[in-house]
Structures are given as structure tokens and as C-alpha cells.
């Protein structure tokens, strides 16, 4: 009985289409597949950023695969051919591994790359990224930001740079159509007449860096002799009500501080008839139903009541 063998895929390579971290892994069928014409050959692909402890593993019948990587580090990948047991009258047959690597040859020392990159998607509408220049770089150094997400034909450069002393230190992005719930890739590179500048790559999803506007129209309503309902409205903008969590800070008579987190635009507070003053503020955040993470809004304007009329039905500012 001759042992069944199969060759690894040919021409295995990682291709960079210029999408700032979204790479193509592609290959060709193995040589000498004539014996298995009736067979659907599969491929097991493993890949990771160099330094990562775990491989991502994909089994596919295709000759390509696409995924996002951190281009600050190298990438390694390996692939082998799988012949299913139906093709071999027995157990699955695997080829040896074909391996490949990819990295962007780094220019400049690490200290020259941008520092403290910070991106916030204000009210799910306006993306603003800011950074500090690299350590020890001269004022002739300038940084340029490029971005890409699935749906764009090619990487785009920042439209509106924020500057300090003539250097770009931030970017206000233009309208980003259909850009959430997918990886958003950024590269900040630089140029200087004196020394090469190291590029930096960043990947995130926009819905996870949203900072909403604070809630508005805070009001009080007396529900009963010992209950007051605090109400507010969702901030203006594209974020639906179902996406908000709220944090409330309530101060009674300048002493008691109550904090609470709620999912709705109301909160019922137990009070006593002795309460002379009541103040509260609210802030908002995108909740776990709409994002994996988020940033608390600023606090709303304070809404206060003081005096004799706490027993009246509706208390407005």
C-alpha cells in the first residue's frame, strides 16, 4: 500500500494592498493534484502578529483570505493542504507547511513616532484624533495621517489637520459613511529633513470610542409625598435611545450624595418632606447593546430646586 501524500500550496504570500493593516493572504493549489480530481481540497491557514502567543486558524476551500493586522509588528503565516478522509479511504492527509512572513521595514528610531495617540468619536458623528510629536524630533518634522476602512477604495489622508507650532498634532475627519462596526485603520507617518520618522499604526472600531453629548431638559416631577421622579431627554444626534446608559448624581440639602446608573431617561428618588434642596446632574454613555466600550459624556447642566414648593406636582428649572 503506497502512502498517500499531498504537496503544500504554492506561491503562498502576504500581500499589502495599502489598507494600513488589512492584508491579503493568498496561495495557489498544490502541484500534482491530478490524483484527487474528484476531491475538494481544503487548506488550513494559521497566522498571527509576531510576538503573539496564539495563532488564528482558518480552514477554507478558497485560495485567499483577508484580515487585519498590527503593522507595528511583523506578521507570520503558514498553510498546508488538507485531503479529507473521503478522498483517501481513511484518515485525513495533511501536507507539510508552507510558511511566509511580512513586515514593513521600520524607518527611524521608535522615539520618533507619534506619542499618546487619542481618538474620540464625538456623538457618533465627528471623529477627532490627536497626538504628541515624537520625543526629540525637530520642528521641521511633520506628521501625516492616513485612514482606511472597508468600503473605501483606497486609504485617504486627513482633510483637516490640527496644528501646533506649524506641526500637525491632530486630525478632524470628514464624514465617515458606513464606518462603524468594522475595523478602522490609521497610519501616522512623518517626514523630516534631519532624520527618518517611524510610522505608527492604529486599529479600532468607531462605535467603541463614542463620547456622547450630555443629556438635556432635566426636570423634576412629584410622584407621591415621598417620591420624586427625575427625568431628562436623550441628547440631540444620531444615537438612538436604546444605546444609552446614564449616570446620575443627586445631592440633597448639600449633604447626601446619591449616584446611580440607569438605562432609561427617568429615575425615581425617595425623599422626605424635610428635603429643602435637590440638585442633580446626568451624563450618558453608549451601552453594551451598541458597543463594547465607550466614553462618558460631560455632565449635564445642573438642575436644582430649593424652597417650599418641592411638594408641587412639576418642578422645572
Amino acid at each position: 500500500d503506497t502512502e498517500i501524500k499531498v504537496n503544500p500550496p504554492q506561491d503562498f504570500e502576504i500581500v499589502d494592498p495599502g489598507y494600513l493593516g488589512y492584508l491579503y493572504l493568498q496561495w495557489q493549489p498544490p502541484l500534482s493534484l491530478d490524483h484527487f480530481k474528484e476531491c475538494t481540497v481544503e487548506y488550513e491557514l494559521k497566522y498571527r502578529n509576531i510576538g503573539s502567543e496564539t495563532w488564528k486558524t482558518i480552514i477554507t476551500k478558497n485560495l485567499h483570505y483577508k484580515d487585519g493586522f498590527d503593522l507595528n509588528k511583523g506578521i507570520e503565516a503558514k498553510i498546508h493542504t488538507l485531503l479529507p478522509w473521503q478522498c483517501t479511504n481513511g484518515s485525513e492527509v495533511q501536507s507539510s507547511w508552507a510558511e511566509t512572513t511580512y513586515w514593513i521595514s521600520p524607518q527611524g528610531i521608535p522615539e520618533t513616532k507619534v506619542q499618546d495617540m487619542d481618538c474620540v468619536y464625538y456623538n457618533w458623528q465627528y471623529l477627532l484624533c490627536s497626538w504628541k510629536p515624537g520625543i526629540g524630533v525637530l520642528l521641521d518634522t511633520n506628521y501625516n495621517l492616513f485612514y482606511w476602512y472597508e468600503g473605501l477604495d483606497h486609504a485617504l489622508q486627513c482633510v483637516d489637520y490640527i496644528k501646533a507650532d506649524g506641526q500637525n498634532i491632530g486630525c478632524r475627519f470628514p464624514y465617515l459613511e458606513a464606518s462603524d462596526y468594522k475595523d478602522f485603520y490609521i497610519c501616522v507617518n512623518g517626514s523630516s529633513e534631519n532624520k527618518p520618522i517611524r510610522s505608527s499604526y492604529f486599529t479600532f472600531q468607531l462605535q467603541n470610542i463614542v463620547k456622547p453629548l450630555p443629556p438635556v431638559y432635566l426636570t423634576f416631577t412629584r410622584e407621591s409625598s415621598c417620591e420624586i421622579k427625575l427625568k431628562w431627554s436623550i441628547p440631540l444626534g444620531p444615537i438612538p435611545a436604546r444605546c444609552f446608559d446614564y449616570e446620575i448624581e443627586i445631592r440633597e440639602d448639600d449633604t447626601t450624595l446619591v449616584t446611580a446608573t440607569v438605562e432609561n431617561e427617568t429615575y425615581t428618588l425617595k425623599t422626605t418632606n424635610e428635603t429643602r434642596q435637590l440638585c442633580f446632574v446626568v451624563r450618558s454613555k453608549v451601552n453594551i447593546y451598541c458597543s463594547d466600550d465607550g466614553i462618558w459624556s460631560e455632565w449635564s447642566d445642573k438642575q436644582c430646586w430649593e424652597g417650599e414648593d418641592l411638594s408641587k406636582k412639576t418642578l422645572l428649572r
Partner: antibody, heavy 119, light 111 residues
Framework: QVQLVQSGAEVKKPGSSVKVSCKAS????????MNWVRQAPGQGLEWMGR????????DYNQNFKDRVTITADKSTSTAYMELSSLRSEDTAVYYC????????????WGQGTLVTVSS | DIVMTQSPDSLAVSLGERATINCRAS??????????ANWYQQKPGQPPKLLIY???RQGSGVPDRFSGSGSGTDFTLTISSLQAEDVAVYYC?????????FGGGTKLEIK
């Protein structure tokens, strides 16, 4: 709620200066550009310049030949536009107007300040 | 400076009918894959209001009957079904280059 509240109407003599203020509230002042636009009576709109409060970067319309100075005070969320060497054709309503970058246009406007230049 | 030329200067349209205003730039206002052309509505005694930015994106709270189209040098504002409250002066504007410039305005009236 976003609000841009401008200072009151002014009557000025030719050759003098006027300084119009614009107090912003309801948003993070430094995240947005502040533009100044004027409109002479019965006429169209003329862009005068803009300031980026985030970094103090300013662009002017050169048609005003160094007569206009735009400033911003982040601590009070207030923008200012000063126009010097006034002449009668500077009689206009002056608007401050907020915009997020160049791709978004100008989404909130102040109520306008009428400046009348007359001897 | 980029010159924005609007046509017509004035327009009278019946209620419920379509109104179309054109704007031509003296050079392309496209860059970075974006058309830096905006449309504003101004009613008497009021500041302008943003209707359309980036040629075709609706401003916040703008009714769906307002739409924008075009790229390069030619842009159009369309009101699909004219309402009485749409009587105003409409301005196009470019924000590609400093100085930002406005068209001369189109006065829209009811026929």
C-alpha cells in the same frame, strides 16, 4: 443645546474699530472651528475668516487686507472678531458660525450683530 | 478665489412642485474624494441654516424633501415638494479653499 450668543448692535464712526464677541455653549468649544461671516444690508454672505480654538490656528480672507483680527478664549468659550479702519461699506450684520472641519460646512450660527458705520 | 455662481437669481414655484437651484464653481471643489460644497437657507431676519454639506449630506434636522447632488464644479439643490415655509434665499458655498466663498443667492418664492 448648542448656542452661540453674540454681543449687541454697535454704531461706529469711520476709521474706528469694532470688536464683536461670540459666547459658545452646549458643546466642547475647542473641538470645532469658529467662522466669522458678514452680510451687508440686502446683500449676500461674505466669509471673513476662522479660528481653530484647539490650537489657535487662523485663516483670514485676504480681501480684508489685515483689518480683521480673530481670537478665541478657551477658558470662557468665547470667540472675538475685531475689524479696524471701519468705513461705511462695513455696515453689515456680522455672524459667528461653528463648523466641524472643512467637509461639514457651518452647522450653527449666532444671532448676528449689526454694526453700523456712520459719521 | 473660487467663484460660486448660482442660477437662477430668483425662482417662483407652485406649492407641492419641485424646485431646483444650480451652483457652478469656477474650479473643481473636489478633494480627498469629497465635494466641499454646502447649501444654506436664509429666511428674513434670521441667520442662515445649513441644509446640505459635502454636496449631498443632509444637515441635522433638515426635512427629507431637501437633497443635494453634483461633484466637481456643478451642484444642484432640489426641494422635491415645495412647502410654504421654504420661501427663503438659498446660498451655495465652497469650503475647499480659503477664502470660503458663497454664491450670490437664489430667492425662492411661491408662484
Amino acid at each position: 443645546q448648542v448656542q452661540l450668543v453674540q454681543s449687541g448692535a454697535e454704531v461706529k464712526k469711520p476709521g474706528s474699530s469694532v470688536k464683536v464677541s461670540c459666547k459658545a455653549s452646549g458643546y466642547t468649544f475647542s473641538n470645532y472651528l469658529m467662522n466669522w461671516v458678514r452680510q451687508a444690508p440686502g446683500q449676500g454672505l461674505e466669509w471673513m475668516g476662522r479660528i481653530d480654538p484647539y490650537d489657535g490656528d487662523i485663516d483670514y480672507n485676504q480681501n480684508f487686507k489685515d483689518r480683521v483680527t480673530i481670537t478665541a478664549d478657551k477658558s470662557t468659550s468665547t470667540a472675538y472678531m475685531e475689524l479696524s479702519s471701519l468705513r461705511s461699506e462695513d455696515t453689515a450684520v456680522y455672524y459667528c458660525a461653528r463648523g466641524y472641519g472643512t467637509a461639514y460646512g457651518v452647522d450653527y450660527w449666532g444671532q448676528g450683530t449689526l454694526v453700523t458705520v456712520s459719521s | 478665489d473660487i467663484v460660486m455662481t448660482q442660477s437662477p437669481d430668483s425662482l417662483a414655484v407652485s406649492l407641492g412642485e419641485r424646485a431646483t437651484i444650480n451652483c457652478r464653481a469656477s474650479e473643481s471643489v473636489d478633494n480627498y474624494g469629497i465635494s466641499f460644497a454646502n447649501w444654506y437657507q436664509q429666511k428674513p431676519g434670521q441667520p442662515p441654516k445649513l441644509l446640505i454639506y459635502a454636496a449631498s449630506r443632509q444637515g441635522s434636522g433638515v426635512p427629507d424633501r431637501f437633497s443635494g447632488s453634483g461633484s466637481g464644479t456643478d451642484f444642484t439643490l432640489t426641494i422635491s415638494s415645495l412647502q410654504a415655509e421654504d420661501v427663503a434665499v438659498y446660498y451655495c458655498q465652497q469650503s475647499k479653499e480659503v477664502p470660503w466663498t458663497f454664491g450670490g443667492g437664489t430667492k425662492l418664492e411661491i408662484k
